[in-house]
């Protein structure tokens, strides 16, 4: 009964995206004999782990094993048993864990250690859990979308296999929005990348790419909201915060201790004469937009051009895929269509934010109130970040494509991460018979 002598002609890989707000497990599949071809890996399953991000388990690490169980069991069901021991498992933690590490390296290590022990208990080829850098997160997201769009393939096609594909080989830029950070990654046009920290050089499938990337820690949608609240409560006359980023009639009590728990609000921290305050929504897009802009320091730039906070940003070039929370938020707001102009998006946001909270709750009865309440802020934040933060204009807005999936695979960093770690993106263009290769991303 030695099944190992007859391996299946497909392979699988598992990547867990341990984000700041939740963890998702992705299962990928590809034909074994075509490992070096571009575009052959596809996602067969996504399993969202029930509960918060792993950084929230810092005081209850013993619960991490149970937390991961359902999705790991799902992986055991989806992947044929004969493949389990050969299936690599990778966990990458992003900005939520970067923030925890900033607070305490020891606590971050403890969480990762328990995660590693839990995942190694499964019959897969566990390859480790680590906190990926913001630069990696940006780079792997860029690799993912361009791999799925067929941009690395040297064969020009007369037909389009994906809706965003133009037949040229010009890569798409990647815009990724998470809960705790946001990444912008693209190939600038004949532009020197003035800051070495933001420069990446790749050789993929025989072609060189000079890529710009930056990850803005604390500028994911959840941490940006905490920042905005911490900034605005500084000037509140009492424990009532009238907030234009929430619908009229919305009320929520916030603990000051929760507000100052994250390193992202440290710059706004002050001693307040109260332990709690109440957010009272007033639903005004323009005021919300103005408040958000105060989070972006645009007064200082040591380069020819900056995004914000003194971070170099070359002139925008080409088309961009905007994914993760960029997509989820805009999809909820029904603003992902290619035909919707930036002016139209702004108009829709003005109307949406002005809608009374009771009306919103009735219209979206199936949506959890915690998420529902934050779409006005999140939508406004996305516009502010893209327009004022990254300098998109009404004209260049049409180059932003809000992407959830490409060819059935989620846009995000996980596929690029796995392609790199499994050595499936060769530096040189493979011949029809795959060559042995030594240089990878």
């Amino acid at each position: 009964t030695q099944n190992k002598a007859l391996p299946e002609n497909v392979k699988y890989g598992i990547v867990l995206d341990a984000g700041s707000s939740h963890t998702s497990l992705y299962i990928y599949k590809w034909p074994a004999e075509k490992e070096n071809d571009t575009g052959v890996v596809h996602q067969v399953e996504e399993c969202r782990v029930k509960g918060p991000g792993i950084s929230k388990f810092v005081q209850k690490v013993n619960e991490i094993g149970i937390y991961l169980t359902d999705c790991m069991e799902r992986a055991r069901e989806v992947i044929p048993r004969s493949q389990h021991q050969e299936t690599p498992v990778y966990l990458g933690a992003t900005a939520g864990m970067r923030l925890l590490r900033m607070e305490s390296e020891e606590l971050a290590d403890r969480v990762l250690d328990v995660v590693e022990r839990s995942l190694s208990n499964y019959p897969f080829d566990f390859q480790g859990a680590r906190i990926i850098t913001g630069q990696e997160e940006g780079a792997y997201g860029w690799i993912t979308i361009n791999y799925l769009l067929g941009k690395f393939s040297q064969k020009t096609r007369w037909f389009s296999i994906v809706p965003y594909e133009t037949n040229n080989q010009e890569t798409f830029g990647a815009l990724d929005l998470g809960g705790a950070s946001t990444q912008v990654t693209f190939v600038p046009q004949n532009q020197t990348i003035e800051s070495p920290d933001n420069a990446l050089q790749f050789r993929l499938y025989g072609k060189d790419y000079n890529v710009y990337t930056h990850s803005f820690l604390c500028y994911g949608k959840d941490q940006a909201l905490w920042q905005k609240l911490a900034k605005d409560i500084q000037v509140a006359s009492n424990e009532i915060l009238r907030d234009p980023c929430f619908h009229p009639g919305y009320k929520k009590v916030v603990n000051v201790s929760d507000l100052y728990k994250t390193p992202c609000t440290k710059r706004f921290e002050m001693t307040l004469p109260f332990q709690q305050f109440e957010i009272q929504g007033i639903g005004n897009y323009q005021q919300c937009h103005q408040s958000i802009l105060e989070l972006f320091n645009t007064s200082y730039c040591p380069y020819s051009q900056c995004a914000f906070n003194g971070i170099f940003l070359p002139p925008l070039q080409g088309d961009f895929g905007a994914f993760s929370a960029f997509y989820f938020v805009m999809k909820f707001l029904n603003l992902t269509s290619e035909k919707v102009s930036q002016e139209k998006v702004t108009e829709m946001m003005k109307k949406f934010c002005a809608q009374p909270w009771e009306e919103i709750k009735t219209s979206y009865a199936g949506v959890k109130e915690k998420y529902l309440s934050e779409y006005c802020f999140s939508g406004t934040y996305i516009l502010s970040l893209l327009l004022q933060g990254y300098h998109f204009t009404a004209d260049s807005w049409e180059h932003i494509h809000f992407i959830g999936k490409i060819q059935g695979s989620d846009a995000g960093w996980t596929l690029g991460y796995m392609l790199n770690l499994t050595n499936m993106i060769p530096a040189e263009q493979p011949l029809s018979t795959p060559l042995s290769h030594s240089t990878y991303v």
Epitope: T1, Q2, N3, K4, R81, S82, H84, Q85, S120, N121, P123, D125, F126
Partner: antibody, heavy 121, light 107 residues
């Protein structure tokens, strides 16, 4: 012929140490997870430890009853798996079997003949 | 950890009779349940894996069934050499655990 041969058992005092060896032949040893299972006199079977492959960074797992006292290791160049037993207790007295699974995982289709460990003062 | 309870502890039957051995898991383990036979002075021998998969070289009279928490090993017509101790084993998750065993003796 697929074979596992254990050695190293014997009589040892409580608190003492012993190292068991298991020599494998007839299969590609480096490709398979290896395990130790024990059986106390007149009792049932108890899984003791597992060691995975080089590609799995030689990951190990242990039964709670031996954790911190026993160490499983392997030498792929010698086709041998070891069980280092420290701080031995009388309840560790058992026949120790070296086992593996040549098909899939977490069951045992190949067993050694066993080696007896007696812990007694 | 997953606890496996085997019943009966002892089963007395005559050659030619049908034997039904039971194994119950403390939580669902899908079909990750394996059966072994052990004779005195010998190492255990795998009979059935993944609840119902038969092993080459094992007589067809041995069959397994069940899924989730309840599993059965059936020997359709007992032969004299079948009288031994039978163990079930959790192959679902670590730590790997065995049932307490069922001793099948000649009546």
């Amino acid at each position: 012929e697929v074979q596992l041969v254990e050695s190293g058992g014997g009589l040892v005092k409580p608190g003492g140490s012993l190292r068991l060896s298991c020599a494998a032949s007839g299969f590609t040893f480096s490709k398979y997870w290896m395990n130790w299972v024990r059986q106390s006199p007149g009792k049932g079977l108890e899984w003791v430890a597992e060691i995975r492959l080089k590609s799995n960074k030689y990951g190990t797992h242990y039964a709670e009853s031996v954790k911190g006292r026993f160490t499983i290791s392997r030498d792929d160049s010698k086709n041998t798996v070891y069980l280092q037993m420290n701080s031995l207790k009388t309840e560790d007295t058992a026949v120790y079997y070296c086992t593996t699974q040549l098909d899939l995982y977490w069951f045992f289709d190949v067993w050694g003949q066993g080696t007896t460990v007696t812990v007694s003062s | 950890e997953i606890v496996l309870t085997q019943s009966p502890a002892t089963l007395s039957l005559s050659p030619g009779e049908r034997a039904t051995l039971s194994c119950r898991a403390s939580q669902s383990i899908s079909d990750y349940l394996h059966w072994y036979q052990q004779k005195p002075g010998q190492a255990p021998r795998l009979l059935i894996y993944y609840a119902s998969q038969s092993i080459s070289g094992i007589p067809a009279r041995f069959s397994g069934s069940g899924s989730g928490t309840d599993f059965t090993l059936t020997i359709s017509s007992l032969e004299p050499e079948d009288f031994a101790v039978y163990y079930c084993q959790n192959g679902h998750s670590l730590p790997l655990t065995f049932g307490g065993g069922t001793k099948l003796e000649i009546k």
